[in-house]
Interface confidence: medium
């Protein structure tokens, strides 16, 4: 007989986490991001849904919009016009893809305390925003852009080409939304509200992905999405700028594409307004190792936008793709000519550079074997950015200030010593010119949000400290979390290990590897979390490990670009290496090791299970990619090149999960996918299943009808985690 596998946390009145705690979100935390409306004023939606105005300097606060007004139209979001005369209220939120949604909008007049009647907005609207000055409105309806000079005015139609699934104006198509812009919008007001820049995406020649949505009807309906998979025809993109003062006099003016970009397939990657008559566009070749930043000026006399060649700045990678996950965006100085930008230095670490005339003459502002991650704000005398420099932990984020007014510039870490144990992973939210800012700490301790003076960095007040959460966790046995590194040959891998309460090194524990592993991702972060794996460690006594292998971010290009053109090799190899090292530590039961992952992690977990090493007893893949030919062009090609004979077709074919079907014979495999996954299509799992059946390999599977890539509806999510828990406990011989 085998000894009982039930894990019992000993001698403690505290209780273990339950799966129910996780599914109910009992231990979720809060953050506080001010909605800045000036240098010293912000809005915030209170717990009871009042919209409250705060002035930091006068310390006054009052409700500018009551919850009863919000409730009268079932509003879930709001937006104040810059002249503070109107508020839009958003209701009937209907999710589309990752960022996009449609909604109904109502305009509330704060002066007279009633909704604006006459020329009401059509519904549903795809995107709506105020101009940066006054109360002009731009919105997208049925793929066309409209303009209102005032909320009560009739709308002016700016574009007429919009057509469902064919031409998108001011909003991205599927692939641009998910893989390039990471927004629901593709329009940008100039700082003074005179011009409106927008992108037109023409998807007319893009192949369609079609899948069934079962719903409740007698017949399923078919969802059709123009979705370019690797090597397929891509959207044709054009950028236009319209003068919103006289939109009827002069139509939208097209902004020219740099010649070196236009000579072959290309992408638009971002637009940044520099000043009221200067705009910066970023473009990318389809083979994504060349990016061009183009600064364009409005020529009043010609009524055109011109982008002189000497205002084109080229960024090129010789070892991989340009940028990190996305190409970084510029942070312009007050002179509207020079800018700060993060890109790889000569040693392959991403750092801040100052560009005054040419990229070749760029001045490196930060340096070291760590990476600058994001530039938050550039003011007259300061530059605020985040990095993972402090104490050499790649999975931390601290906020730094460089005093660019000083010569030489001096650097100060704003956050490193504030709450050293509790807070090692920060982001920030700055008022317009950084007179004040909020710091949001995500962990490793309980998240906390604080308000600070932008000149002295002094803490002014705590905005949210999660006291209730702290109290409710007092009687919970939380696992211990360690972040360490392991070495193998010349490589260093950071890992996070979640150890059961009362962990005893002399005992043997089952091990679950949680993997994502996608290019430019990071799993080993110093953040607070109470989730499914926390429960598995707390209640079921499972050791959890997350490992950042080659291809992951913020440790230099040598580590990042190792996976270039050969996805599915080193990501898997490094997980296997880590497992062997964990076994050597002595407290892992070699007979009970599992791996699981979602999306890219499902791909890596599948390949790891099929590695033929015998390391894993079982594993789970949720919504896995199974072949890079099935995934989006922008993503697949960024890291793999094209699936053509003269490029990288061979590795596209070699790196599929299907090619390793035979190797699943000796593991327990649970394959899970939502049938309405617009992102990683159900096709991926269907092909894995087909290959396993053809190879006569037994496996378990679960589909979630009408669920997308997140499998996030309450009932589905509960079912999913319950199902995975049963599978794991069975695999590890843990009794229910």
């Amino acid at each position: 007989l085998r000894p009982s596998r039930v894990y019992k946390p000993e001698g403690n009145t505290k209780r273990a986490l339950t799966l129910k705690d996780i599914l109910n979100g009992t231990f979720s935390y809060k953050t506080y991001f001010p909605n800045w409306i000036s240098e010293q004023e912000y809005l915030h939606q209170s717990e009871d849904d009042n919209i409250v105005f705060y002035n930091i300097e006068t310390r006054e606060s009052y409700i500018i919009l009551s919850n009863s007004t919000m409730k009268s139209v079932n509003a879930t979001d709001y937006g104040l016009s810059p002249d503070r005369q109107f508020v839009y209220l958003e209701s009937d939120y209907s999710k589309l893809w990752r960022y996009s949604y449609t909604a109904t909008y109502y305009i509330y007049d704060l002066q007279n305390g009633e909704f604006v009647r006459g020329y009401e907005l059509p519904r549903p609207i795809q995107y709506l925003c105020w101009s940066p000055v006054g109360s002009k409105l731009a919105y997208v309806y049925q793929n066309n852009i409209y303009l209102k000079q005032r909320p009560g005015d009739p709308p002016f139609q700016i574009t007429y080409t919009g057509r469902e699934n064919r031409i998108f104006n001011g909003i991205p198509d599927w692939v641009y939304e998910e893989e390039m812009l990471a927004t629901k919008y593709a329009l940008w007001w100039s700082p003074d509200g005179k011009f409106l820049a927008y992108v037109e995406f023409n998807d007319s020649d893009i192949p369609i992905i079609a899948y069934s949505y079962y719903g409740d009807g007698q017949y399923p309906r078919t969802i059709n999405i123009p979705y370019p998979k690797a090597g397929a025809k891509n959207p044709v993109v054009r950028v236009f700028i319209v003068d919103t003062t006289y939109p009827h006099h002069v139509g939208p003016m097209e902004v020219p594409v740099p010649e070196m970009i236009a000579s072959s397939d290309y992408y638009f990657s971002w637009l940044t307004w520099v000043s009221s008559e200067r705009v910066c566009l970023q473009w990318l070749k389809r083979v994504q190792n060349v990016s061009v930043l183009s600064i364009c000026d409005f020529r009043e006399d010609w009524h055109a936008w011109e982008c002189p060649k000497n205002q084109e700045h080229v960024e090129e990678s010789r070892t991989g793709w340009a940028g990190g996950f996305f190409v970084s965006t510029p942070a312009f100085s007050q002179d509207a000519t020079s800018y700060y930008k993060i890109f790889s230095d000569k040693d392959g670490y991403k750092h801040i550079h100052y560009i005054k005339d040419t990229v070749e003459n760029a001045i490196q502002i930060t340096s070291g074997k760590w990476e600058a991650i994001y530039i938050f704000r550039v003011t007259q005398d300061s530059l605020f950015y985040s990095s993972n420099e402090f104490e050499g932990y790649p999975g931390r984020r601290n906020i730094y200030r460089i005093s660019i007014g000083n010569s030489p510039p001096s650097k100060k870490c704003v956050t490193c010593h504030l709450r050293k144990e509790r807070c090692q992973y920060y982001t920030a939210s700055f008022s317009y010119k950084a007179k004040y800012y909020a710091l949001v700490c995500y962990g490793p301790g309980l998240p906390i949000s604080t308000l600070h003076d932008g000149r002295t960095d002094q803490e002014i007040q705590v905005l949210e400290e999660n006291k209730e959460l702290e109290n409710s966790l007092r009687n919970i046995q939380l696992p211990k979390v360690e972040i360490k590194k392991l070495k193998d040959g010349g490589l260093t891998f950071w890992y996070k290990m979640i150890l059961p309460p009362q962990f005893d090194r002399s005992k043997k524990y089952p091990l679950l590897i949680q993997v994502y592993g996608g290019p430019c991702s990071q799993s080993v972060k110093s953040v607070f979390a109470v989730n499914w794996i926390t429960y598995l460690a707390s209640k079921e006594g499972i050791v959890i490990a997350l490992v950042d292998g080659r291809g992951t971010a913020f440790q230099g290009d040598k580590f990042l670009h190792a996976v270039y053109r050969k996805l599915g090799v080193y990501e898997v190899e490094d997980q296997l290496t880590a497992v062997r090292k964990f076994i050597e530590m002595g407290f892992i039961d070699e007979e009970r090791i599992a791996i699981w992952g979602w999306s890219y992690g499902g791909y890596v977990s599948s390949l790891a299970l099929a590695s033929g090493t015998g390391l894993f007893k079982c594993g789970i893949a949720v919504a896995p990619v199974s072949s890079w030919e099935y995934y989006a062009s922008i993503y697949s090609e960024r890291f793999m090149g094209l699936p053509t004979k003269d490029d990288n077709l061979e590795h596209y074919k070699n790196s599929t999960v299907m090619a390793r079907a035979e190797y699943f014979r000796n593991v327990d495999y649970l394959l899970i996918h939502g049938t309405a996954d617009d992102n990683v299509h159900f096709q991926n799992s269907a092909q894995i299943a087909k290959a396993l059946v053809n190879a006569q390999v037994d496996f378990q599977a679960m589909w979630y009808s009408d669920q997308n890539h997140g499998i996030s509806s309450g009932r589905s999510q509960n079912h999913l985690y319950t199902h995975m828990t049963h599978f794991l406990k069975q695999c590890f011989s843990l009794s229910d």
Partner: antibody, heavy 117, light 108 residues
């Protein structure tokens, strides 16, 4: 490779008309503004006219305003210059050039227009 | 209109020597809109310098541009036989775009 090829030049009497053409290849013609620049024998360069990429905006030097008309056919990748009421001082080599503001980055080989009785 | 005045009218130099050509504008011109061209007899002009100092594609590094405001300079560090030609500066800041009258660089 960008190529611009002018045609239509020749000898014409004062007061006469002529239509110049410029066939473009090697770039996305409709995305770029185009210009005509001329050079009188033994003299310097003089900008004549320009047209936006879409053809929606046109511009002329004072010396030709009202007499010359610039146009383009983006479906044929061709630029035109219709010259009416020609004068002796219009005698020049006419170049078609890509670009119209900061610089002219590509030029055709030119076509000679001679106005003489 | 902006008048561009080039000096000298003619520059007589030997191969290997340094050539310095000047272009003065009647009013301030943004660097972004100042270009230089080279023209050889019987040929179309060729773009040399854009944005006052950036070499156009394929232009050898012996050609360099500098200056701002109203004074701009084209320098040829070591004259090669193929460099003997007429050089024009041009502004595109205001309508109409205008050219200088040209500087002829001839063999001494």
């Amino acid at each position: 490779e960008v190529q611009l090829l002018e045609s239509g030049g020749g000898l014409v009497q004062p007061g006469g008309s002529l239509r110049l053409s410029c066939a473009a290849s090697g770039f996305t013609f409709s995305s770029y503004a185009m210009s005509w620049v001329r050079q009188a024998p033994g003299k310097g360069l003089e900008w004549v006219s320009a047209i936006s990429g879409s053809g929606g905006s046109t511009y002329y030097a004072d010396s030709v305003k009202g007499r010359f008309t610039i146009s383009r056919d983006n479906s044929k990748n061709t630029l035109y210059l219709q010259m009416n009421s020609l004068r002796a001082e219009d005698t020049a080599v006419y170049y078609c050039a890509k670009g119209w503001l900061g610089n002219f980055d590509y030029w055709g080989q030119g076509t000679l227009v001679t106005v003489s009785s | 209109e902006i008048v561009l005045t080039q000096s000298p009218g003619t520059l007589s130099l030997s191969p290997g020597e340094r050539a310095t050509l000047s272009c003065r504008a009647s009013q301030s011109v943004s660097r972004s809109y100042l270009a230089w061209y080279q023209q050889k007899p019987g040929q179309a002009p060729r773009l040399l310098i854009i944005g006052a100092s950036t070499r156009a594609t394929g232009i050898p590094d012996r050609f360099s541009g500098s200056g701002s405001g109203t004074d701009f300079t084209l320098t040829i560090s070591r004259l090669e036989p193929e460099d003997f030609a007429v050089y024009y500066c041009q502004q595109g800041q205001v309508i109409p775009p205008t050219f200088g009258q040209g500087t002829k660089v001839e063999i001494k």
